[in-house]
């Protein structure tokens, strides 16, 4: 059985105000079954930027459809970018619990910063 | 605008119960980790307690196994049971919503916990 | 558990003169120190983060500096809603979260 690993495949992603940026998680397995969330940030203090299940999150969306069953790509779509969007974004792989899921592994984060405005 | 709202504060005796409520709104209160602080009369600031986004519980040596930290997202409401309170409890708990970097960007007025026989 | 330990305790400054106090740390902090200001009666206000980031909306007068266990705090021209208690904050090492035990801005 194949170890689940968190792909970020950029360390660091320039982005435009104004623009839309996409954040890059793929999974390397389906096992174990729970979400994947992502966050801004790390320690208890850390963001929530989107979870499938629950949430209001309207400048967010996902590249692929994360309802089918055997997705693996749980990258999303953050719009209308500000300068307040600046940070370190991590998709987290919990594993499905009662009562609660528990965080299994973490990708290695992408850092967001702003680039130059197009001349 | 980002609005704190404490509230439940009081006068209790040593080894009493007190539960305190903060009404949050102005964010999305389930997307930020939320704390509570407190200030002793003429004292500094002191952590308390911190509820993660995913509801992950953290508490100060000096309350751990008395004061339980909770939140209702439905309700945008952050509480915090206060147990077996000692005269030391005694301070102004304010609540605070915590961002992405770890610091309290924005807090409540605060309510006064008075423990005393 | 990082202790802050915060210099002077008090510190007496004439209105429009600059005030520089410190937080020092007992192991590295990195950047990760922020500032707050507290006026009587009022709740604690973020001014600093990341040892010299201004949160929203705080004026250019605040200014911080330092890294690793030694960090400044700098108003540059006290105006006198500035007289207050200043305490900084280490945002690296968690639980717990610690304060430093305050710095009094007092007018001269």
């Known amino acids: 059985e194949e170890e689940l690993q968190m792909i970020q495949p950029e360390k660091l992603l320039l982005v435009t105000v104004g623009k839309t940026a996409t954040l890059h998680c793929t999974v390397t397995s389906l096992l174990p079954v729970g979400p994947v969330l992502w966050f801004r940030g790390v320690g208890p203090g850390r963001e929530l930027i989107y979870n499938q299940k629950e949430g209001h999150f309207p400048r967010v969306t996902t590249v692929s459809d994360l309802t089918k069953r055997n997705n693996m790509d749980f990258s999303i779509r953050i719009s209308s970018i500000t300068p307040a969007d600046v940070g370190t974004y991590y998709c987290v792989k919990f594993r499905k619990g009662s009562p609660e899921n528990v965080e299994f592994k973490s990708g290695p984060g992408t850092e967001m910063a702003l680039g130059a405005k197009p001349s | 605008d980002v609005q704190l709202v404490e509230s439940g504060g009081g006068l209790v005796r040593p080894g009493e119960s007190l539960r305190l409520s903060c009404a949050a709104s102005?964010?999305?209160?389930?997307?930020?980790?939320v704390t509570w602080v407190r200030q002793a009369p003429g004292e500094g600031l002191e952590w308390v307690s911190l509820?993660?986004?995913?509801?992950?519980?953290y508490y100060a040596d000096s309350v751990k196994g008395r004061f339980t930290i909770s939140r209702d997202n439905s309700k945008s409401t952050l509480y915090l049971q206060m147990n077996s309170l000692r005269a030391e409890d005694t301070a102004v708990y304010y609540c605070?919503?915590?961002?992405?970097?770890?610091?309290?960007?924005?807090w409540g007025l605060g309510t006064l916990v008075t423990v005393s026989s | 558990e990082i202790v802050l330990t915060q210099s002077p305790g008090t510190l007496s400054v004439s209105p429009g003169e600059r005030a520089t106090f410190s937080c020092r740390a007992s192991q590295t902090v990195g950047s990760k120190l922020a500032w707050y200001q507290q006026k009587p009666g009022q709740a604690p206000r973020l001014l600093i983060y990341?040892?010299?980031t201004r949160a929203t909306g705080i004026p250019a007068r605040f200014s911080g500096s330092g890294s690793g266990t030694e960090f400044t705090l700098t108003i540059s021209s006290l105006q006198s809603e500035d007289f207050a208690v200043y305490y900084c904050q280490q945002h690296t090492d968690w639980p717990p979260y610690t304060f430093g035990g305050g710095t009094k801005v007092e007018i001269k």
């Open positions: 605070a919503k915590v961002t992405w970097k770890n610091v309290f960007d924005y």
């Open positions: 102005g964010f999305t209160f389930t997307n930020y980790a």
């Open positions: 509820i993660s986004v995913t509801g992950t519980t």
């Open positions: 990341d040892a010299n």
